[in-house]
Interface confidence: low
């Protein structure tokens, strides 16, 4: 656990010609505030995707009124840091979005109005516990200068805030099996209290209360042995191979969204759609009013000032959602043909075509195998002016990129359990049945024999993550 801290140093006109007009005037005094959004990894996700690492709003800055005839100076800033707490390990790489917002203090109906002045974004590598990193970003004619750092909250230390430390009980050395906590040599690594019952031989934990298994062991307490070859069974004479992508529990299992929020899975985590009056990654924060600035992307907030009243965001063109947080998805009209990937660049739509297709909307079929890639060992077959991929066992789809699920048709009879494997499927039969598909009852004399399982996977072996 720890905190990402952002210090805004200045926001004002950038160098060069074309200085921006001051955002405030004598008729419309205003003040600034900032919003920061953090995401793990070096993702180039859209601005409206969830801030999976966290987000924060600054306080409002001092009220500013433009002096007539004066050029726009650096604008007065809010006091203090923007702090984004993170509960898990610091990922080491992150993407950030920093938005500069203007709060107009004129006589608007329904209270003050907010508008987005500037948005900057970037991707950075940063070790927790390091010094402040300085940065300058430009958005149009505006320039934002800021510093940031990630620091661990005690007892966590390290570049990812994953090691736990505590002060020494004895002045000279740490307890048995515990190391000094460099660079805090006067502290010792704290023994982790793993989940109750976690196997001391085969389990370990990196955070209190968890139980993670060493290779070859599985189960909630790491007490169940698994085959050491189930993931790395031979595909050829000399290569270690694959086959470990099995469905795990989904991010939405158990519904992590509080207060009636609905959960939808995203490629790396989950996203909560919150009912009105709640917000936050898990809809855990309540009592939102217009004073909290909940409308993004220039949305106008209308609502009462008391905590119990709802608010409504009136979104500008191109945005939607209860907080104007979603860009209108022009790709939902599926303009890209033949499976092309649609990219909404804001100013234009672009189609990224699959192999074998070309054109602005991927409408041209190149109609041969030249340059066509069939994934996962598939081979391209021409014929009749068209082409197709003949896929290796266990894969399907136009380019053999889809992992076929041989268990989808429930091929194991008599209650047998089906396991997907890169060479096909394996049935683990219920007691009393045998055969490749558990189709034969066991004879009383036990005369029949079960056909051999594919190499490297025994019937009943669960696959595992590495």
């Amino acid at each position: 656990a720890g905190v990402f801290e952002l210090q805004i140093h200045s926001f004002g006109p950038g160098p060069g010609p074309g200085a921006p007009r001051s955002p405030c005037s004598a008729r419309l005094p205003c003040r600034l505030f900032f919003r920061v959004c953090l995401k793990p990894g070096l993702s180039e996700e859209a601005a409206e995707s969830p801030c999976a690492l966290g987000a924060a709003l600054s306080a409002r800055g001092p009220v500013y009124t433009e002096q007539p005839g004066a050029p726009a100076p650096d604008l007065p800033l809010p006091d203090g840091l923007l702090q984004v707490p993170f509960r898990d390990a610091w990922p080491g790489t992150f993407s950030f979005i920093i938005e500069t917002w203007r709060e107009e203090l004129g006589d608007q109906i329904g209270g003050p109005a907010w508008s987005l002045l500037a948005r900057v974004a970037g991707r950075r590598r940063l070790a927790a516990g390091g010094p402040w990193a300085r940065d300058i970003q430009r958005a149009g004619a505006w320039e934002l200068r800021f510093s940031y750092r990630a620091r661990c909250e005690p007892p966590a230390v390290g570049t990812a805030c994953t090691r736990l430390c505590r002060p020494r009980s004895a002045p000279s050395r740490c307890g048995p099996g515990l190391r000094p906590c460099a660079p805090l040599e006067d502290e010792c690594e704290a023994p982790l209290v793993c989940r109750a019952g976690c196997s001391p031989e085969h389990g370990f934990c990196e955070q209190p209360g968890e139980c993670r298994c060493l290779e070859g062991w599985t189960g909630p307490l790491c007490t169940v042995p698994v085959s050491t070859s189930s993931c790395l069974s031979p595909r050829g004479p000399s290569s270690a191979t694959t086959g470990c992508l099995v469905p795990g529990p989904g991010p939405c299992d158990g519904n992590p969204c509080a207060n009636g929020g609905s959960c939808s899975e995203t490629p790396r985590s989950f996203e909560c759609t919150c009912p009105r009056g709640f917000y936050g990654l898990r809809c855990e924060v309540s009592g939102v009013t217009c004073a909290d600035g909940p409308c993004f992307n220039g949305g106008l907030c209308v609502g009462g000032a008391d905590p119990d009243s709802a608010y409504i965001c009136h979104c500008p063109p191109g945005f939607q959602g209860s907080n104007c947080e979603k860009r209108v998805d022009r790709c939902s009209l599926q303009p890209c043909r033949n499976g092309g990937l649609c990219l909404d660049l804001g100013h234009a739509l672009r189609c990224r075509c699959r192999a074998g297709f070309a054109g602005p909307r991927c409408e041209h079929d190149l109609d041969d195998c030249a340059g066509r890639a069939c994934a996962n060992g598939g081979t391209c077959v021409e014929g009749g002016g068209a082409h197709r991929c003949s896929c290796a066992l266990g894969f399907g789809g136009r380019d053999c990129r889809e992992r076929a699920d041989p268990c989808a048709a429930r091929p194991c009879a008599h209650g047998g359990r089906c396991y997907a494997h890169f060479s096909g499927l394996v049935c683990a039969c219920a007691p009393g049945y045998m055969g490749a598909r558990c189709e034969f009852p066991v004879h009383p004399d036990g005369a029949s024999a079960l056909p051999a399982a594919p190499p490297g996977l025994r019937p009943g072996d669960p696959q595992r993550y590495l």
């Epitope: 990894g41 070096l42 898990d88 610091w90 990922p91 080491g92 790489t93 070790a127 570049t159 990812a160 994953t162 955070q207 968890e210 993670r212 993931c231 790395l232 270690a240 694959t242 470990c244 992508l245 795990g248 529990p249 989904g250 991010p251 299992d253 790396r268 985590s269 989950f270 993550y465 590495l466």
Partner: nanobody, 126 residues
């Protein structure tokens, strides 16, 4: 096309050292976890070490802790396995293996093995 090419194997005496290299192409190792897997004659495979180049986080099998060190140079898109104090039981074919991000389940991020190289033979014998 994803490719992993191992090098640096060979014959070494007990107590000696070797450094294995894994040159990756067709993807950026920064976005993945890279591990070294070994297969010894008559034994199953063992994931001996792995690194997450994103933050330098490493894990080792108990059998090699303190003797092997995994590292990565993202500028060269290459991972390394420094093997010191080698023993006869370290004799095996060593494969470089890539794991891709598979999802965030419960409170953990999972990586699943999806590619490996052809391997390089390490023989420890006097």
């Amino acid at each position: 096309e994803v490719q992993l090419v191992e090098s640096g194997g060979g014959l070494v005496q007990p107590g000696g050292s070797l450094r294995l290299s894994c040159a990756a192409s067709g993807f950026n190792i920064y976005d993945h976890s890279i591990g070294w897997v070994r297969r010894a004659p008559g034994k199953g495979e063992e994931l001996v070490a792995r690194i997450y180049p994103t933050n330098g986080y490493t894990r080792y099998a108990d059998s090699v802790k303190g003797r092997f060190t995994i590292s990565a140079d993202t500028s060269k898109n290459t991972a390394y396995l420094q093997m010191n104090s080698l023993r006869a039981e370290d004799t095996a074919v060593y494969y470089c293996a890539r794991s891709s991000y598979s999802g965030y389940y419960g409170s953990h991020h999972y990586y699943a093995l999806d590619y490996s190289g052809q391997g390089t033979l390490v023989t420890v014998s006097s």
